[in-house]
C-alpha cells in the first residue's frame, strides 16, 4: 500500500490522543533505555510503511501484535485517512479470530513496540533531518 | 459462517435520520477494528468512520452528523446518520477492516 496520500495531520492526531498512550501501557514496567531503535523512516509514507509492517506482520519472537489494542487503533485510523487502505486485506488478522486466553508478552514482541514508539516518534517530526 | 449483514438503509429527505446496523457471526466483533465505508455511483469507496476498543475516527464530511456505536453483547456495530445530505447517498458497508465486508446497504437521501 502506497501511504503517500494520507491525512498525515490527523493521523497524527489519533497517535498523541489515544495510540501513543496504548504504547506506553504496553511497555509499562520496561525502561524506555532497554531496547536501542534499529528501524527508522526518512518521511511520512515511509514511516507509515514500516509502522504497517511491524505492527502487522508477523515476526520470528513476535508471532502478532494485531490483536493489540494500539494495533486496532492504528488500523482503524488509516482505515479512515488513508484511502484505498482498507481494501487491503492484512493477513496477521486472521489470526485473531481465535485468541489465546492468557496473553504472553516476550522480550521480543517488547523491543518490536519499542521500535513503533521510535517510528511514530519519527512521524510526528517529519521536518527533522534524518541522524 | 463468519459474515457481516448491514440493514437500515432506505429513502430519508434531507435533514433527517437513519440508523443502519452491522450484525457480525462467526466472530465477535469486539477482537476487531470495524468500520463503516460508503460508495456513491462512480466514486472510490471511502471511509466514512471507525471504530476500536470504544475509540472512534470520523471523515471529515460527517463529523458532527454521524455516530459510530458497538454494542458488543449484540455482535453488532451501528452508524447513526444525522443531518443527511443528498451527497450522503451511496451503498453503505460495514467492515472488519481489514479482513472482512458486508455487502451494503443503499441510503438515498433525496426530496
Known amino acids: 500500500y502506497d501511504f503517500t496520500n494520507c491525512d498525515f495531520e490527523k493521523i497524527k492526531a489519533a497517535y498523541l490522543s489515544t495510540i501513543s498512550k496504548d504504547l506506553i501501557t504496553y511497555m509499562s514496567g520496561t525502561k524506555s533505555t532497554e531496547f536501542n531503535n534499529t528501524v527508522s523512516c526518512s518521511n511520512r509514507p515511509h514511516c507509515l510503511t514500516e509502522i504497517q509492517s511491524l505492527t502487522f506482520n508477523p515476526t520470528a519472537g513476535c508471532a502478532s501484535l494485531a490483536k493489540e489494542m494500539f494495533a486496532m487503533k492504528t488500523k482503524a485510523a488509516l482505515a479512515i485517512w488513508c484511502p484505498g487502505y482498507s481494501e487491503t486485506q492484512i493477513n496477521a488478522t486472521q489470526a485473531m479470530k481465535k485468541r489465546r486466553k492468557r496473553k504472553v508478552t516476550t522480550n521480543k514482541c517488547l523491543e518490536q513496540v519499542s521500535q513503533l514508539q521510535g517510528l511514530w516518534r519519527r512521524f510526528n517530526r517529519p521536518l527533522l533531518k534524518q541522524q | 459462517e463468519v459474515q457481516l449483514v448491514e440493514s437500515g438503509g432506505g429513502l430519508v429527505q434531507p435533514g433527517g435520520s437513519l440508523r443502519l446496523s452491522c450484525a457480525a457471526s462467526g466472530f465477535k466483533l469486539g477482537y476487531y477494528a470495524m468500520g463503516w465505508f460508503r460508495q456513491a455511483p462512480g466514486k472510490e469507496r471511502e471511509g466514512v468512520a471507525t471504530?476500536?476498543?470504544?475509540?472512534?475516527y470520523y471523515a471529515d464530511s460527517v463529523k458532527g452528523r454521524f455516530t459510530i456505536s458497538a454494542d458488543n453483547s449484540k455482535n453488532t456495530a451501528y452508524l447513526q446518520m444525522n443531518s443527511l445530505k443528498p451527497e450522503d447517498t451511496a451503498v453503505y458497508y460495514c467492515?472488519?477492516?481489514?479482513?472482512?465486508w458486508g455487502q451494503g446497504t443503499l441510503v438515498t437521501v433525496s426530496s
Open positions: 471504530i476500536a476498543g470504544g475509540t472512534t
Open positions: 467492515a472488519a477492516i481489514g479482513w472482512r
